[in-house]
């Protein structure tokens, strides 16, 4: 829900001012204190799955 048109990075990535490029938010698990991780929103809840076929 960031303001529209403000983020040049695709969903799941965030802008690094230090590196001057978009970075994958998945890498924040390994390096959570990287500057771009601040812009990584919480992952949306997993879709509901039926427990029977």
């Amino acid at each position: 829900e960031q303001a529209p048109g403000t983020a040049p990075c695709s969903r799941g990535s965030s802008w690094s001012a230090d590196l001057d490029k978009c970075m994958d938010c998945a890498s924040c698990r390994a390096r959570p204190h990287s500057d771009f991780c601040l812009g990584c929103a919480a992952a949306p809840p997993a879709p509901f799955r039926l427990l029977w076929p």
Partner: antibody, heavy 120, light 105 residues
Framework: QVQLVQSGGGLVKPGGSLRLSCAAS????????MSWVRQAPGKGLEWVSA????????YYADSVKGRFTISRDNPKNTLYLQMNSLRAEDTAVYYC?????????????WGQGTLVTVSS | LTQSPGTLSLSPGERATLSCRAS???????LAWYQQKPGQTPRLLIY???SRATGIPDRFSGSGSGADFTLTISRLEPEDFAVYYC?????????FGGGTKVEIK
């Protein structure tokens, strides 16, 4: 409407602890990073700490590192600042703020502020 | 971040030019300006060095790049007399300038 409501300030002795809370409403809390900023009496703004939307990434000013802990409870839409080993120089009005943090950075919504006084 | 001047004494209707200088080059996208009036919370004016925040009048404008940034108030209104702060994000920390007080001459 978009709102941040703070609680938890007060008078505490040097070496003591205090926890500040910031309740968010009117926006999708998990989509935004959050931050704490403080302002000592008659002084300028000083950034204290920030946390990502997921809560997995935290950042601290050198002046509070190891003493303060930022956290968030996303289901409760609440931000916290646990302050330990408080010093006289921590006396300030503490603000929570919503952070626009993806390419553009800025704090676009602020809480009303809460005064923390550290004195014996 | 170093802001200058510390105090600016001007009259309503005059133009105000506030400076914010970083010790090294910073990304323009991370530079913001805030206004704070006595007893009030700070208010975001400008983000991305030059984009006005929601509801900010067009007399406020931001410019600059590299290490030098400027906030300009084209014609001061009585409600514009306040303290202004610049802020930058980089190296995993947010930094505020010391502030510029714009007072009535």
């Amino acid at each position: 409407q978009v709102q941040l409501v703070q609680s938890g300030g007060g008078l505490v002795k040097p070496g003591g602890s205090l926890r500040l809370s910031c309740a968010a409403s009117g926006f999708t809390f998990t989509s935004y990073a959050m931050s704490w900023v403080r302002q000592a009496p008659g002084k300028g703004l000083e950034w204290v700490s920030a946390i990502s939307g997921s809560g997995g990434s935290t950042y601290y000013a050198d002046s509070v590192k190891g003493r303060f802990t930022i956290s968030r409870d996303n289901p409760k839409n609440t931000l916290y600042l646990q302050m330990n080993s408080l010093r006289a120089e921590d006396t300030a009005v503490y603000y929570c703020a919503r952070v626009r943090a993806n390419y553009y950075y800025g704090m676009d919504v602020w809480g009303q502020g809460t005064l923390v006084t550290v004195s014996s | 971040l170093t802001q200058s001047p510390g105090t600016l004494s001007l009259s309503p209707g005059e133009r105000a030019t506030l400076s914010c200088r970083a010790s090294q080059s910073v990304s323009s996208s991370t530079l913001a300006w805030y206004q704070q009036k006595p007893g009030q919370t700070p208010r975001l004016l400008i983000y991305g060095a030059s984009s006005r925040a929601t509801g900010i009048p067009d007399r406020f404008s931001g410019s600059g790049s590299g290490a030098d940034f400027t906030l300009t108030i084209s014609r001061l209104e009585p409600e514009d007399f306040a303290v202004y702060y610049c802020q930058q994000y980089g190296s995993s920390r947010l930094t505020f300038g010391g502030g510029t007080k714009v007072e009535i001459k």
